[in-house]
Amino acid sequence: WPPPGTGDVVVQAPTQVPGFLGDSVTLPCYLQVPNMEVTHVSQLTWARHGESGSMAVFHQTQGPSYSESKRLEFVAARLGAELRNASLRMFGLRVEDEGNYTCLFVTFPQGSRSVDIWLRVLAKPQNTAEVQKVQLTGEPVPMARCVSTGGRPPAQITWHSDLGGMPNTSQVPGFLSGTVTVTSLWILVPSSQVDGKNVTCKVEHESFEKPQLLTVNLTVYYPPEVSISGYDNNWYLGQNEATLTCDARSNPEPTGYNWSTTMGPLPPFAVAQGAQLLIRPVDKPINTTLICNVTNALGARQAELTVQVKEGPPSEHSGISRN
């Protein structure tokens, strides 16, 4: 608020007032009269810059008059009372109401005193964020989408992620005239490492007390990535059974595991149990390459592991131990 003058009446009002589209807003305007000063106010006037005539007048004998009587109202001025408060309420704010307004007091003996107020018409946007489910493409593609709908002015969208990525932001007119819908795509080359990770869309707008944060959990569809674990290159004849595990990462989840060898079906000492393969004790050396083939909706991938069961005394810490 501007500081009051010294020894003179001065009009006090904020330089800018925000209001929301469709709502009502009060344009505050007061006459500040120093203690030793006297003044008589005979008229309050509101006018909009660039328009001929006044939009609202409160005259000390005639009372209030409005250019649009259903949309305007002096909130405090009353006939027979001192006219010190010219605050004006505007109903049903429209985009075209945004602009500069002059609040003016006609005073005696000082003359007229006025101040300008900028009315900002805002629209609070609705924000959504959603994942864009993708497959491995080798090319950058939108992986997340953040939309701020019906903002005035347009919202600012930024992305926060440890994964890199590039934003691609665009604007289109909103459903209500004067509003804007902002769409921001987060673009990255899809990889299995990104699947299940989070990125955050940050939406900033004048109407928000603080930025809105929307988290998106990324989805990348990819065929199985397969490895076999459980073998330590230290298996010996006569030892007890051991277990190999077919480790598969995929999206969607694996639908089937199939164990085999390079020679064809599994030998008798190997028993498939889903993702696991049970290796029973053997009495002669083995050198076999095992294959685990994993299937999901996008295809099948396999891993191979060559297993040797060697002669020689088993150590205490060997992979297959006796009961």
């Epitope: 006297v38 005979s42 006018a47 005259h59 004998t61 005696f108 003996p109 003359g111 007229s112």
Partner: antibody
């Protein structure tokens, strides 16, 4: 109904003074500022000055400073204008008028300065 | 000081016609302009305040418009009783200032 009743016509000699009265009724006297307007014969209107009956605050047209003095008597709800050192240039009809802009007018007082 | 200029000293019109009286301020006076009608031998009567608002009881054939420096009083469907002098006046700053007047004559 608001009424402003002015005193009657005056014929005065050059160099003399005259005091015109404006008695008000129909409203609270201190509620409206009171102004005085000069209209020379067949001429336009000229604002002399105004007074706030509530506190006696005045504002004069520079052209009439030293010529006109505005006062009020709250007890009788009457405003006064005294004109001094009169010359033929001061011959005119003088109006009192209440409120800004000038909404309520008296019937006018004719002042003729002649030897 | 602000000067109010009424360039037409006289205007002639017929009953039922529409006539516009103009007034120009030497500087911005916002909408702080009043219009007065003065019939022969009478005191001025206030018609319009704040450039475009009629005082109660003033016929709606009197319309004021304008802001800033240019102002107009329009009388539509002129009546014989509208024969009078019309004065504009600014009340944005002191001294209050009147235009020189426009005399409306009825043919």
């Amino acid at each position: 109904e608001v009424q402003l009743q002015q005193s009657g016509p005056e014929l005065v000699k050059p160099g003399a003074s005259v005091k015109i009265s404006c008695k008000t009724s129909g409203y609270t006297f201190t509620e409206y500022t009171m102004h005085w307007v000069k209209q020379s014969h067949g001429e336009s209107l000229e604002w002399i000055g105004g007074i706030d009956p509530n506190n006696g605050g005045t504002n004069y047209n520079q052209n009439f400073k030293g010529k006109a003095t505005l006062t009020v008597d709250k007890s009788s709800s009457t405003a006064y204008m005294e004109l001094r050192s009169l010359t033929s240039e001061d011959s005119a009809v003088y109006y009192c008028a209440g409120v800004i802009p000038l909404e309520y007018w008296g019937q006018g007082t004719s002042v003729t300065v002649s030897s | 000081d602000i000067v109010m200029t009424q360039s037409q000293k006289f205007m002639s019109t017929s009953v039922g016609d529409r006539v516009s009286v103009t007034c120009k301020a030497s500087q911005n006076v916002y909408t702080n302009v009043a219009w007065y009608q003065q019939k022969p031998g009478q005191s001025p009567k206030a018609l319009i305040y704040s450039a475009s608002y009629r005082y109660r009881g003033v016929p709606d054939r009197f319309t004021g418009s304008g802001s800033g420096t240019d102002f107009t009083l329009t009388i539509s469907n002129v009546q014989s009783e509208d024969l009078a002098d019309y004065f504009c006046q600014q009340y944005n700053s002191y001294p209050l200032a009147f235009g020189s007047g426009t005399k409306l004559e009825i043919k």
